[in-house]
């Protein structure tokens, strides 16, 4: 058994690529808008032009299409600590990213927050930073890696899980303890 | 089901500090972002603090920077807002949401009014 086509499929499926069928008159196919621009009316007639206009500042279409209106250009969150790489133009949205040194930490799949690269004092990095992803730091002798900063094994409480890494120190705190002076 | 309990909110002058909680069960606590959330008199929702699933990152809204502190204890599934040097415009109802804008789950919320 074929599955039927949605209405959607059906309406796509039957003008060639770069036309869409006409909203009053599905025997006509109109030419879509280029990028930078919107529909403004469809065409009369099969072989007449579509009545595009171009985006006006603050919008812009990215792609061939035939929107009724442009979208509204993003704007980067400066509470984010976000900047602006690109402005906006009629056919390319703002291009919002962050500073020398920071990476970007996604909250959502559209939304994140650049914050700094980790700088690995008291350890050697081990992967740099990238866009997405801070330094990852490998600690010195007598460090653990604590929220990927490296902290001295003196502040390393029993119950936390650097007890393993700092072990020998525990034991040489201890045993420097234990032992009586000579 | 996902629940969210609020607790901690309350009548405090200006300049005094409140701890918020925020009890979460239902889901795996210990693998979502989660946020603060207010709504003051009047006014629409303001997106006050996030923090990530392990405690790496938070955000912070400009207006409570450096005064209010988001942590989280995902051993006991609770959602912490310390909030210091409180003014008359943090006075709205606080809410813990799971995730980060837009958000999919809300407490009931916990009033605190700040005013002398």
């Known amino acids: 058994l074929v599955p039927h086509l949605g209405d959607r499929e059906k309406r796509d499926s039957v003008c060639p690529q770069g036309k869409y069928i006409h909203p009053q008159n599905n025997s006509i196919c109109c030419t879509k808008c280029h990028k930078g621009t919107y529909l403004y009316n469809d065409c009369p007639g099969p072989g007449q032009d579509t009545d595009c206009r171009e985006c006006e500042s603050g919008s812009f279409t990215a792609s061939e299409n035939h929107l009724r209106h442009c979208l509204s250009c993003s704007k980067c969150r400066k509470e984010m600590g976000q900047v602006e790489i690109s402005s906006c133009t009629v056919d390319r949205d703002t291009v919002c990213g962050c500073r020398k040194n920071q990476y970007r930490h996604y909250w959502s799949e559209n939304l994140f927050q650049c914050f700094n690269c980790s700088l690995c004092l008291n350890g050697t990095v081990h992967l740099s930073c990238q866009e997405k992803q801070n330094t990852v730091c490998t600690c010195h002798a007598g460090f653990f890696l604590r929220e990927n900063e490296c902290v001295s094994c003196s502040n390393c409480k029993k119950s936390l899980e650097c007890t393993k890494l700092c072990l020998p120190q525990i034991e040489n705190v201890k045993g420097t303890e234990d032992s009586g002076t000579t | 089901e996902v629940q969210l309990l609020e607790s901690g909110g309350g009548l405090v002058q200006p300049g005094g500090s409140l701890r918020l909680s925020c009890a979460a069960s239902g889901f795996t606590f210990a693998t979502y972002n989660m946020s603060w959330v207010r709504q003051a008199p009047g006014k629409g929702l303001e997106w006050v603090s996030a923090i990530d699933a392990g405690g790496m990152h938070t955000y912070y809204a400009d207006s409570v920077k450096g005064r209010f502190t988001i942590s989280r204890d995902n051993s006991k599934n609770t959602l912490y807002l310390q909030m210091n040097s409180l003014r008359a415009e943090d006075t709205a109802v606080y809410y813990c949401?799971?995730?980060?804008?837009?958000?999919?789950?809300w407490g009931q919320g916990t009033l605190v009014t700040v005013s002398s």
């Open positions: 949401a799971k995730g980060t804008e837009p958000f999919d789950y």
